[in-house]
Amino acid sequence: MKVLQEPTCVSDYMSISTCEWKMNGPTNCSTELRLLYQLVFLLSEAHTCIPENNGGAGCVCHLLMDDVVSADNYTLDLWAGQQLLWKGSFKPSEHVKPRAPGNLTVHTNVSDTLLLTWSNPYPPDNYLYNHLTYAVNIWSENDPADFRIYNVTYLEPSLRIAASTLKSGISYRARVRAWAQCYNTTWSEWSPSTKWHNSYREPFEQ
């Protein structure tokens, strides 16, 4: 049994890091493999992650971590029984994939203005809380070409757009994702989408 593709990990910079790897053949990850991880710090204890299958030869493990900060570095050991298959390290702050924003809501009752709001996925004491920027994707269910991205580069988790910038009388969907420049993160997954019917009063022709 050998590792074909070494583990690569990403952290949500809060409580979970996800590691994925591939074996050289079909593997029952949860019964045959264990991923041990330990913070390089005083008093830290070794933890064991039981991987799940991710395709025939692929495995994925969700590592639980407390109080993740930029100074943290973890040792990783992948075991098959008594055999050490791979040894490496992982610094969560250098491989961040933020959590997806939540609670995306479209407020349509604001005088021909659409107000989209969502929730920051981090608590205020997390460093990423004040460093997320967002991308909002709005698209028409009827017209695949009517697809737009709004970049929200301020901290407020909201976006205002004129309803008239979208077509009236049809349904739209929106979703939002986040990233943080400070840690050069990847984009988060998209939030669940929300749907609304766009209608506004056309201005009177003169």
Partner: antibody, heavy 116, light 111 residues
């Protein structure tokens, strides 16, 4: 919000022991390390040791080895620091502080006076 | 005896800028992360800067930190009378067993 509430001031005689408590609230107690530091009157900060509330393991500054004991009670989210064989030089304000590589939150401090 | 050396005192007038240095070695500042703590008179220390240059929420951007080699610097701009306090740098010794270190402390006087 995070709070670290320490026990009140103590006056002890040389050779005695003192046990200072630090009750934590506003966060997951077992998820954060707790440090103890002290500050003698008019002096700087001095690190004493650290406890991992999750398993109760400890590490102490060499200067205090054999004289200090740090414990925790997860049922009350409280950590304790006991210092024995007290001498006059141990007169100081003792602080608990939450954190790992840096100390996010500090208790208000407990003044321990050692005097005959 | 701390191995992190700070000037005993610094002073400046309101509105001015002041810097506080923290000098260490390759086994501490040179190989670890620096934090800074503010201790107002009669109170407990408060985290001001961590991870060399990051501010906890609620700390104004008048406070900034930097690190170069084996020394670190805390800068305070737009000095206010309320900034008068003792300031301590902190880091970790990584030579044998890891343990935290505090600097000798600097008394800031706002003239």
């Amino acid at each position: 919000q995070v709070q670290l509430v320490q026990s009140g001031a103590e006056v002890k005689k040389p050779g005695a022991s003192v046990k200072v408590s630090c009750k934590a609230s506003g966060y997951a107690f077992t998820s954060y390390y707790m440090h103890w530091a002290r500050q003698a009157p008019g002096q700087g900060l001095e690190w004493m040791g650290i406890i991992n509330p999750s398993g109760g393991s400890t590490s102490y500054a060499q200067k205090f080895q054999g004289r200090v004991t740090m414990t925790r009670d997860t049922s009350t989210s409280t950590v304790y620091m006991e210092l024995s064989s007290l001498r006059s030089e141990d007169t100081a304000v003792y602080y608990c502080a939450r954190g790992k590589w840096w100390l996010y939150n500090w208790g208000k401090g407990t003044l321990v006076t050692v005097s005959s | 005896q701390s191995v992190l050396t700070q000037p005993p005192s610094v002073s400046a007038a309101p509105g001015q800028k002041v810097t506080i240095s923290c000098s260490g070695g390759s086994s501490n500042i040179g190989n670890s992360y620096v934090s800074w703590y503010q201790q107002l008179p009669g109170t407990a220390p408060k985290l001001l800067i961590y991870d060399n240059n990051k501010r906890p929420s609620g700390i104004p951007d008048r406070f900034s930190g930097s690190k170069s080699g084996t020394s670190a610097t805390l800068a305070i701009t737009g000095l206010q009378t309320g900034d008068e306090a003792d300031y301590y740098c902190g880091t970790w010794d990584t030579s044998t067993t890891m343990y935290p270190l505090f600097g000798t402390g600097t008394k800031l006087t706002v003239l």
